[in-house]
C-alpha cells in the first residue's frame, strides 16, 4: 500500500504506527488498539477506528422521515472485535459477558444477550441517513450547489463514488444527504458508505482522522457551512430484531 | 484561460525511467482533480492515473499500478508522473487532464501532450 | 473493468447528414457517461457529459442520448468541420475506459 514514504505516516488514518519494516523496506502501519495492517491509500474501517480510538487515551418535508426500522447509535463507543478485514464481527460482547448483535456500520440491531446469543451474519447497512442541521446564514443556500458541493467533498475527501451519494435534501436549516451502496453495487476498491459516514461525522465534529490534512472546511459559492447537530440513521438490507418492550419504551 | 502544458517526454530505453510534468495555468490548480491519460494508434485513449485536489486520494490504472507513480505541486501549480520499469507497450503521447471541478472522472481541459517512446 | 464498445468503427456521411454513433458498456454505468471530439493532430475536446448535457462551447446540433448500458451521440446535421474520431468514456467507477473511437468522414 502507499503510505507517505518519506516521512512514513498513514495519510488516511492517524491513529497508527508506522514504519518502514514493510517488504523492501516499504512504510507499513498498523492500526492501534489491533495492530492489523492498514491500507493507507483509502479509509481505514469504521471497526478498527472504533478500537484504535478505545485503546487511546481518553480526552475529555421534502426532506426523507427514516423508516421505523432505521438504527440510531445510541450505544456510543465500545471496543468492537474485527474480523480479519477489518469488518465487524456480527456479535460484539463486552467484559461482562453481555453480547448482541450489530451491523456492518458497528450499531446494535438486536436486544442485548447472553454468550447463547447467536449472530448469523453480519447484516449489511445499506443505506445511511446523515441528518445535518447548519447554523443561522444570511439566506438559505442554493439546494443545487449544496448538493454538487455536498458530493464533491465526498468524492474528494472520502473517495466515495457519486453514484451511492443518492440524494441531497435541503429545508433549511436541516440537510439530509442519503448514501446508498448494496452489496451488488460495491466493487473492489470502493469505500464503503460505512466508513465515509463516520469520517464525515468524525470531521464535522472537528475531530478529523486524516494525518496532516487540513480540517474540514465546507462552503458554498463561498459562503462556510457549519454545522451545529448531526444524527445519523442506519438502515439494514434485513431490518433490526428488537423486542416490543423496547420499541414501546 | 486554462492551459496544461506536458513536458518530460522523449526516447528512453526498455527498463528506464522518465518524469513527465505538466504546468497549469488560467484556474486554480488546488481545488481540481487532475488525471495522465495516454493514447496509442492501436489501442485510442486509455487512462492511466487520477490525483484529487490535495493528494490524498490517488487512483491508478489496475494494468499500470506498481509502475507508475502520480504527484503534484500545488504551490508550483505542477502534476508529475514517475514511470519506471518502462516496456514499449508504454510507447503513446501523455496528455496531462484537469477533471471536471465536481470530481465527476470526466476531462474538461487537455493539455497538448508530450511524447514517450521506449525503444532500444 | 467495464468495457466500452463504439459502432461504427469508421462512418462517411454526406454535409447536412443527420449522424448516430452509438456506445455500449458491458454493463449498467447510469448515466456516468462523457463523449470527446479528437480532429486530426488535434487533442480531445469535451463534447458530452452525464450522457445528455453539452459541454460549454460545444454547437448545439451535438446531443447525446441514453442511460444504462446503451448511448448514443447525435449530430443532427453534419457539418464539415465535424470530421473527427469520436470517444466515449465511462466514469462510473475508479477504472475509467474509453471506447475505441469511431472516426466520421465527408462523403
Known amino acids: 500500500h502507499t503510505a507517505a514514504q518519506d516521512n512514513c505516516t498513514c495519510p488516511t488514518n492517524k491513529m497508527t504506527v508506522c514504519s518502514p519494516d514493510g517488504p523492501g523496506g516499504r512504510c507499513q502501519c498498523r492500526a492501534l488498539g489491533s495492530g492489523m495492517a492498514v491500507d493507507c491509500s483509502t479509509l481505514t474501517s469504521k471497526c478498527l477506528l472504533l478500537k484504535a480510538r478505545m485503546s487511546a487515551p481518553k480526552n475529555a418535508r421534502t426532506l426523507v422521515r427514516p423508516s421505523e426500522h432505521a438504527l440510531v447509535d445510541n450505544d456510543g463507543l465500545y471496543d468492537p472485535d474485527c474480523d480479519p478485514e477489518g469488518r465487524f464481527k456480527a456479535r460484539q460482547c463486552n467484559q461482562t459477558s453481555v453480547c448482541w448483535c450489530v451491523n456492518s456500520v458497528g450499531v446494535r440491531r438486536t436486544d442485548k444477550g447472553d454468550l447463547s446469543l447467536r449472530c448469523d451474519e453480519l447484516v449489511r447497512t445499506h443505506h445511511i441517513l446523515i441528518d445535518l442541521r447548519h447554523r443561522p446564514t444570511a439566506g438559505a443556500f442554493n439546494h443545487s450547489d449544496l448538493d454538487a458541493e455536498l458530493r464533491r467533498l465526498f468524492r474528494e475527501r472520502y473517495r466515495l463514488h457519486p453514484k451511492f451519494v443518492a440524494a441531497v435534501h435541503y429545508e433549511q436549516p436541516t440537510i439530509q444527504i442519503e448514501l446508498r451502496q448494496n452489496t451488488s453495487q460495491k466493487a473492489a476498491g470502493d469505500v464503503d458508505i460505512g466508513d465515509a459516514a463516520y469520517y464525515f461525522e468524525r470531521d464535522i465534529k472537528g475531530e478529523s482522522l486524516f494525518q496532516g490534512r487540513g480540517g474540514l472546511d465546507l462552503r458554498v459559492r463561498g459562503e462556510p457551512l457549519q454545522v451545529e447537530r448531526t444524527l445519523i440513521y442506519y438502515l439494514d438490507e434485513i431490518p433490526p430484531k428488537f423486542s416490543m418492550k423496547r420499541l414501546t419504551a | 484561460e486554462v492551459q496544461l502544458v506536458e513536458s518530460g517526454g522523449g526516447l528512453v530505453q526498455p527498463g528506464g525511467s522518465l518524469r513527465l510534468s505538466c504546468a497549469a495555468s488560467g484556474f486554480t490548480f488546488s481545488t481540481y482533480t487532475m488525471s495522465w491519460v495516454r493514447q496509442t494508434p492501436a489501442k485510442g485513449l486509455v487512462w492511466v492515473s487520477t490525483i484529487n485536489s490535495d493528494g490524498y486520494n490517488i487512483y491508478y490504472s489496475d494494468s499500470m499500478k506498481g509502475r507508475f507513480t502520480i504527484s503534484r505541486d500545488n504551490a508550483k501549480y505542477t502534476l508529475y508522473l514517475q514511470m519506471n520499469s518502462l516496456r514499449a507497450e508504454d510507447t503513446a503521447m501523455y496528455y496531462c487532464?484537469?477533471?471536471?471541478?465536481?470530481?465527476?472522472?470526466?476531462?474538461?481541459?487537455w493539455g497538448q501532450g508530450t511524447l514517450v517512446t521506449v525503444s532500444s | 473493468d467495464i468495457q466500452m464498445t463504439q459502432s461504427p468503427s469508421s462512418l462517411s456521411a454526406s454535409v447536412g447528414d443527420r449522424v448516430t454513433i452509438t456506445c455500449r458498456a458491458s454493463?449498467?454505468?447510469?448515466?456516468?457517461l462523457a463523449w470527446y471530439q479528437q480532429k486530426q493532430g488535434k487533442v480531445p475536446k469535451l463534447l458530452i457529459y452525464a450522457a445528455t448535457n453539452l459541454a460549454d462551447g460545444m454547437p448545439s446540433r451535438f446531443s447525446g442520448s441514453g442511460s444504462g448500458t446503451d448511448f448514443t451521440l447525435t449530430i443532427s446535421s453534419l457539418q464539415p468541420e465535424d470530421v473527427a474520431t469520436y470517444y466515449c468514456?465511462?466514469?462510473?467507477?475508479?477504472?475509467?475506459?474509453f471506447g475505441q473511437g469511431t472516426k466520421l468522414e465527408i462523403k
Open positions: 468514456q465511462h466514469y462510473y467507477s475508479n477504472q475509467l475506459t
Open positions: 454493463e449498467n454505468i447510469d448515466n456516468y
Open positions: 487532464a484537469r477533471c471536471s471541478y465536481y470530481s465527476y472522472d470526466y476531462f474538461d481541459y
